[in-house]
Structures are given as structure tokens and as C-alpha cells.
């Protein structure tokens, strides 16, 4: 299936040009998306091209500026947030990145009624997290690991927690491992729907071992960065959840929410919190051995001013074939009765589907079914449930938005997006206004991305929000590669792949092949999305064929494929890449003497193991920031898939699955190993150990480190990295410079 046909005709050939590496590094062909900042059922805010904050009312068709770019610029604001009562805006400046989601910033409060900044009781700096209450203009913020509350922006703050301490106790914000591997947010506090209560997590990292690495900077002596970071099998953070009444915060103070007994009996995690009403909250907990999850619904007891979580409101989710959930355990979406909910989990056939839980999980009513997966529940209204899935035409790498009418019986299903722009758009997400009165659809491809606004009742398109016209025009004289998404059937396993082919691809010729791999559990690389990136350039200008293959362990094709890698990472992911390469060779257009593989992070691990597989298939390969041993990676992630590195659990496979154990096998391949020295995620230690093992085995290899760079290798390092990798591959494939 050719998703992006080449537009090359003989008459045009002279004016068409190939992509250059410079195009990619400059972001010449990057696209824009439009996500409305919804403030009601029919209004949204958007930052205009000239940086004014503009309010749009869909029903009146009117728009007006509420905050000028001059005000934004006066404090160098890069972000803003309107209070729900529409009286104030916080302006965020001095953004300073910490980890993947976390950052600190300076916040100013601007009073829209009088056009002035709020003076008196200004916020301290830098703040770790700040948010408005869902109603009115209360503020909750985290400063120096403690939580503060303001009833109004100009009021003095009320301090909620006092035990916060850097790298020891975190209140309202996650520690490193919870941020990266469990919550995937920079915050760990949640307002109740009307702002009566504020729930928050406290993480105690006192006993967690610390990862320490040098940050070289410009000083005479390097700094040492210390992060409490639990590696596989190490001591984990201790979590507690508290709730405080924000109307009378001093009255009884924070009340702890009890942990379900079956969870509290051994090491556990808190996985998410969902408010149902102002006096009902839902907490999700997970055993350290992550195949048992408990959803606990708790109620406020006015008489005792405490939170009660009856056993009858505990719902257990257990996996017998793998871990609980997909990448994370799914979160519930509550219905209007404030007790029943919709949730995605595996059905009896091993496919993730939407279920409706009214009393017990055992009596759950299955809402969707089939040999495909429901991926996200966007919104539940009185009469509709909106969700995304990969059902349409049986392509796992697509995403369409569906509406199920839950108000009628039997419920009817409608695909909202399947036929909108069928060739251009096969991978959607959505953003809904209050009560789903309107929604925005954001299409990521395979054609040029487009964002549109729709009526939530009729699904009618109202207007185009962003169609990337400039990008479309810029690409008119570019020879883009062709892309196809197909599947291989091998030993009862379906291997979907994406192949990126040079513009003048000719099946009768032979081409060098580059495999790009990620391959981590519950990931998906073969997606129907638009991208003009490094591999597009390699196909367009350098004449390479690039392939991405989703093997065992990848997501959205059922539990059999997903959980195949359970407790044995590094085996089937590698086998399936190798199997695919053999199939590609059989297709007849691959030069089998010029095959390479590359990957980043988990992909660096897989590419390293593939190069060291002893098959002789690969001439060369690159590993960027690879994991080299699962004993070096984070507990929450690693143990989910591998269990514990103990003798009575899975230590043997932890030892067998290292890159270092295969050092000898790198002798007959050209290996480029790359890592940032300040990688807080996959520590430089991983590559240091690979390099040591290769040196000890007297195996030649190439390496590049990036001083003071983290897992993302951003900024100027990006340019250097891709230039360096390009040279390496061109040399490997004997392509002239």
C-alpha cells in the first residue's frame, strides 16, 4: 500500500530536488498542529502567531484578544493559564527543564479586570508546579518540595506540607522514577471537580540508592548530579496519598487515604488518582510485581472528616499471562452516576477493549470487541462515548475516532474519522470541549497533518484550524521517498513493517538496507503518520531502503504478541528483526552485503544485540544511548517486564540478556556506540560497560560521547549526532560523500 506516492514526472524532474541533511537539521519540513485550549463548551484560547492570547467563541463566531503580546513580553512569558473565573492569568517565564516532564519556572499573576500584575504576596521562585483550582481562582503550587495554597492570587499562602526536602521527600510532585515510569507528569496533586479538596502524593526517597554522575559545565571542577534512582531490585520510593479541604485547610489538615490491604501487604506503587465528585475519589494501586492492580473508590465521611475506602469498592485487575495493563494500567472514565465507569483492559481473547464496570470487574459489560484494540477513551457524555482504536481496515498502526451511543439500546457505533480524508488522514487524536459540545481532530498522517474543528452533536466539520499550507508548498519540489506499510506472516506471527523507498525505486536494482528499531514493550513503530526526518533524507538523497518492523512485545495487536517478551527481554524482539531482514532479502531488491541496523534507547539495546547475534546479516550498526543490562535500568519499568533480579526470580535472564555477554560477537561488525554523559534516564554507565567489555575482548569499535547531554541529545548535539551517523553509514555502505 503506497501511502505517499512520489510526484515525480519526467517534465518536473529537473525542478525536483532530493532532501538534504540540512533540511532535516533545520526543521525545514516540520509541521504544526492546533490543539484548542478549551475554556468552556464553546470557547477556546489560542496563542496567535504574533503571541497575543485570543479567545474564540465557536457559537458567535467571534474572537477577541484578552492578553497582549506586550504584556507577555514584559515578563518574557512562554506560557499562560487563565483562571476558571476568568479574572486572572498566570504567566510562566524562566522555564528551566529538569527531567522529561518536570521543569521549574517563575510565575506572575495578571489581573484582567484592571490590566495590572498582582502586587503583594507575590509567588516565590522558582516554582516546581502551579495550577488553578477547577472553579474560581484558588492557586496550588509546589515550592522547594512543599505544597502551598492561595485562596486568591493576592492572598498570603497557606503552607500545606512542611517535610519537603530536596531528593528526600517530594510533596505534590513526583520523584524521578514516578515521573518517568508511572505518572508521566510533572505533578502529583489533583483538585476535586469543584475545588473543595486537593489530593496529593508524598514520595519518600530517603532509602533509595543514588545515581551520581559528573556534569562538566565550565567550572574548574565538575559538579556531581545526584538523583535517587531505584534500579531493578533496589529499594523503591514509599508513597502516601493525602487529601486536604481547601476551604478550611487548617481545620483538620491533610487526611491520608488508606491503601487496600491486599496491596499494602508487600511493596507497592500508587499509579493514578481520578476524582469522581467533590466527595468521591478513585485511587489506583499496583503491586511491585506488576501483575495485580487494585482500583479503590473512596468516599468522604463528613462526621469523621476522613476518607473511607470500603472493600466492596475495590476492583482487582490481574494478568495471568504478563503484566497488568499495556504500558501503564489504564485509568477509569466515570459515568454520570458517579460510581460506574468505563475502562480498557484485556478481554477473554487477549485484546484490550472497553468494558463497563457497574458493580464488580467479573460482571463487566464488554463495550467493544474484535481482533483489534481500543486505545484511548477520550470522553463520556450522557449519551456518547468517544474512543480511538485501530479497528479500521485491520491496520494496527492507524488511529480512528469512534462514537458509541450509550444513551440508546442497543448501543450503536459510528466511526467519526474513517472516511473524512481517507488517503491523507489515518492517524488521529482528538480534543474535546466541556460536555463534548465541540471537538478538534488532529490528523498526523500519513499525508500532511491537518487540524479541524467539529460539532460534537453532528460531527460536522466547522472549520480548518491548521492545514500546513506552507509545508505543502515547500514540499512541492521535493523528491520524497515512497512509504509502504505491509505485513509478513512468519510462524503464526504477524510482523507489520514500514518500508521507506528511494523516490526512483526500481525493484530490479539492489539497495542498501537500514533497519530502524525501537522494539520496547508496548511500543509501536509502524504507524501511519507523516514525517520528514533523517531516514527520509537517507532514502531520498542517499538511496537507502529503510525498514521499521514491529515484532513481538509491541502493542495494539493483542496480548499474545505483547506479552510474548514477558520475563525474557532481548530475545524475541531481536529474533523478529532478524527474521524480517531475511524476508526483505528474499524480496530481491536488497544488497545483502550492505545491511545496517540502528536504534536509540531500547532500540540501541536491540540493535546492539542484533549486531551481536552472530548471524552475519549486518555489516554495521549504531546504538544511541542503549540499555546494556537490565540491572542498570529503573525498577518500575524493568521489573514490570522482567520480574526481580534475584536468584529465586529472574536473575539468570537478567545476566543472559546483557550486551556485554555478547562482546565477542561484535568482532565481525562495525559498531558505533553513542551516549550522553549526563543521561539521567539510561545512565552513561550502560555504554561505559559495553565499551569496557569490548576493550577487554579486544574488539575494535567506534564511539562518540556527548558531554553534559541527557537522553535526548538535543541542541547542537543533534546536528553533530546525525552528521556523524550519516558519515558512518555512508562509509559502511561505500557511498561517496
Amino acid at each position: 500500500i503506497v501511502l505517499r506516492p512520489s510526484r515525480v514526472h519526467n517534465s518536473e524532474e529537473n525542478t525536483m530536488r532530493a532532501l538534504t541533511l540540512k533540511d532535516i537539521l533545520n526543521g525545514t519540513f516540520s509541521y504544526k498542529t492546533f490543539f484548542p485550549n478549551w475554556i468552556s463548551g464553546q470557547e477556546y484560547l489560542h496563542q496567535s502567531a504574533d503571541n497575543n492570547i485570543v479567545l474564540y467563541n465557536i457559537e458567535t463566531g467571534q474572537s477577541y484578544t484578552i492578553l497582549s503580546n506586550r504584556t507577555m513580553k514584559s515578563v518574557n512569558a512562554s506560557n499562560y493559564g487563565l483562571s476558571p473565573d476568568r479574572q486572572f492569568v498566570y504567566l510562566e517565564s524562566d522555564y528551566s527543564k529538569l527531567w522529561r516532564y518536570s521543569y521549574t519556572a517563575t510565575y506572575y499573576i495578571y489581573d484582567l479586570s484592571n490590566g495590572e500584575f498582582v502586587r503583594g504576596n507575590e509567588l516565590p521562585r522558582p516554582i516546581q508546579y502551579l495550577c488553578w483550582s477547577p472553579v474560581g481562582s484558588k492557586l496550588a503550587y509546589v515550592y522547594q518540595n512543599n505544597i502551598y495554597l492561595k485562596q486568591r492570587p493576592g492572598d498570603p499562602p497557606f503552607q500545606i506540607t512542611f517535610n519537603g526536602r530536596e531528593n528526600k521527600i517530594f510533596n505534590g510532585i513526583p520523584d524521578w522514577v514516578y515521573e518517568e515510569e508511572m505518572l508521566a507528569t510533572k505533578y502529583a496533586l489533583w483538585w476535586s471537580p469543584n475545588g473543595k479538596f486537593l489530593a496529593y502524593a508524598e514520595f519518600n526517597d530517603t532509602d533509595i540508592p543514588v545515581i551520581a554522575y559528573s556534569y562538566y559545565g565550565d567550572e574548574q571542577y565538575p559538579r556531581t548530579i545526584n538523583i535517587p534512582y531505584p534500579k531493578a531490585g533496589a529499594k523503591n520510593p514509599v508513597v502516601r496519598i493525602f487529601i486536604i479541604d481547601t476551604t478550611y485547610p487548617a481545620y483538620v489538615g491533610p487526611q491520608e487515604v488508606p491503601v487496600p490491604a491486599m496491596i499494602a501487604s508487600s511493596d507497592y506503587y500508587f499509579s493514578w488518582l481520578t476524582w469522581v465528585t467533590d466527595e468521591r475519589v478513585c485511587l489506583q494501586w499496583l503491586k511491585r510485581v506488576q501483575n495485580v492492580s487494585v482500583l479503590s473508590i473512596c468516599d468522604f465521611r463528613e462526621d469523621w472528616q476522613t476518607w473511607d475506602c470500603p472493600k466492596t469498592q475495590e476492583h482487582i485487575e490481574e494478568s495471568r499471562t504478563g503484566w497488568a495493563g499495556g504500558f501503564f494500567v489504564s485509568t477509569p472514565v466515570f459515568s454520570y452516576d458517579a460510581i460506574s465507569y468505563y475502562k480498557i483492559f484485556s478481554d477473554k481473547d487477549g485484546y484490550k477493549h472497553i468494558h463497563y464496570i457497574k458493580d464488580t470487574v467479573e460482571n463487566a459489560i464488554q463495550i467493544t470487541s474484535g481482533k483489534w484494540e481500543a486505545i484511548n477513551i477520550f470522553r463520556v457524555t450522557q449519551d456518547s462515548l468517544f474512543y480511538s482504536s485501530n479497528e479500521f481496515e485491520e491496520y494496527p498502526g492507524r488511529r480512528n475516532i469512534y462514537r458509541i451511543s450509550i444513551g440508546s439500546y442497543p448501543p450503536s457505533k459510528k466511526c467519526v474519522t474513517c472516511h473524512l480524508r481517507k488517503e491523507r488522514c489515518q492517524y488521529y487524536t482528538a480534543s474535546f470541549s466541556d460536555y463534548a459540545k465541540y471537538y478538534a481532530l488532529v490528523c498526523y498522517g500519513p499525508g500532511i497533518p491537518i487540524s479541524t474543528l467539529h460539532d460534537g452533536r453532528t460531527d460536522q466539520e466547522i472549520k480548518i484550524l491548521e492545514e500546513n499550507k506552507e509545508l505543502e508548498n515547500a514540499l512541492k519540489n521535493i523528491q520524497l521517498p515512497k512509504e509502504e506499510i505491509k505485513k509478513l506472516e512468519v510462524d503464526e506471527i504477524t510482523l507489520w513493517y514500514k518500508m521507506i523507498l528511494p523516490p526512483q525505486f526500481d525493484r530490479s536494482k539492489k539497495y542498501p538496507l537500514l533497519i530502524q528499531v525501537y522494539g520496547g514493550p508496548c511500543s509501536q513503530s509502524v504507524r501511519s503518520v507523516f514525517a520528514v526526518n533523517w531516514i527520509s533524507y537517507l532514502a531520498s538523497k542517499e538511496g537507502m531502503v529503510i525498514a521499521l518492523v514491529d515484532g513481538r512485545g509491541t502493542a495494539f495487536q493483542g496480548d499474545k504478541l505483547l506479552y510474548a517478551v514477558y520475563r525474557k527481554l532481548g530475545v524475541y524482539e531481536v529474533e523478529d528483526q532478524i527474521t524480517a531482514v531475511r524476508k526483505f532479502i528474499e524480496m530481491g531488491f536488497i544488497d545483502e552485503k550492505r545491511i545496517a541496523i540502528w536504534g536509540w534507547s531500547y532500540g540501541g539495546y536491540v540493535s546492539s544485540l542484533a549486531l551481536a547475534s552472530g548471524t552475519g546479516l549486518f555489516k554495521c550498526g549504531i546504538a544511541v544511548a542503549p540499555v546494556s543490562s537490565w540491572e542498570y535500568y529503573a525498577s518500575v519499568y524493568t521489573e514490570r517486564f522482567m520480574g526481580l533480579p534475584t536468584k529465586d526470580d529472574n536473575l539468570e535472564h537478567y545476566k543472559n540478556s546483557t550486551v556485554m555477554a555478547r562482546a565477542e560477537y561484535f568482532r565481525n561488525v562495525d559498531y558505533l556506540l553513542i551516549h550522553g554523559t549526563a543521561d539521567d534516564n539510561v545512565h552513561f554507565q550502560n555504554s561505559a560497560q559495553i565499551a569496557k567489555a569490548l576493550v577487554n575482548a579486544q574488539v575494535d569499535f567506534q564511539a562518540m560521547w556527548y558531554s553534559d547531554q541527557n537522553h535526548g541529545l538535543s541542541g547542537l548535539s543533534t546536528n553533530h549526532l546525525y552528521t556523524h551517523m550519516t558519515h558512518f553509514l555512508k562509509q559502511c555502505f561505500s557511498l561517496s560523500d
Epitope: 468552556s40 470557547e43 497582549s68 476568568r86 492569568v89 484582567l112
Partner: nanobody
Framework: QVQLQESGGGLVQAGGSLRLSCTVA????????MGWYRQAPGKRREWVAT???????NYADSVKARFTISRDNAKNTVYLQMNSLKPEDTAVYYC?????????WGQGTQVTVSS
Amino acid sequence: QVQLQESGGGLVQAGGSLRLSCTVAESIDVRNAMGWYRQAPGKRREWVATITTGGRTNYADSVKARFTISRDNAKNTVYLQMNSLKPEDTAVYYCNAAPPILNSWGQGTQVTVSS
């Protein structure tokens, strides 16, 4: 520049009532969220009440249960019914969208409450 014309102010004794009107020019529709604001002598302008696009109303604590905001879509007019007036309600009253449209304030209407 959006035209907003406030009227209905005056001098009233404490405990009395007034009804303020705000007529909005074509360029803005009162079906947008609209608000009343006031500025007392020597003080900053402050928010008083809002009526949302959906018709929900919100009030500053100081006027709750005494003031009522409403609108007439056909006349493109927003109202503020003020009962049980107090001397501290003395101010110039303005209407605007909520949040306010930048640089678009009318002349306002003076409300004076004598004790």
C-alpha cells in the same frame, strides 16, 4: 475597539436598588461570556459578576445574593440588578466580555450609595 455603553447608574440610599444596562455594539455578541466590573475611588478595577455562554452566573463574594446578572440576547444587552446596596458599592461600573476584551472599556456608569 468594541463599543460598550453602560447606563442606569445614579445616586441611591443604602438599602436601595438600581438596574444597570449595557448595550453592546454589533461587533460583540452578548452570547459571549459577559461580566460586570467596578472601580471604587482610589482603588483598582475589580470583577463583580459573570454570565457564561451557557447562562451560568458567578459573583464576587462581596455582592453574592444581592446582585443578579442577566442578559437579553435579542436586544444584545446585559443587565446588573443591584439590591440591598451598601456605601461600599459606590464605584464606576463597567461591562465587558469575560475575560475582558483588551483595551475595550466603555465610559462606565457611576453608582453612588449614600448612608
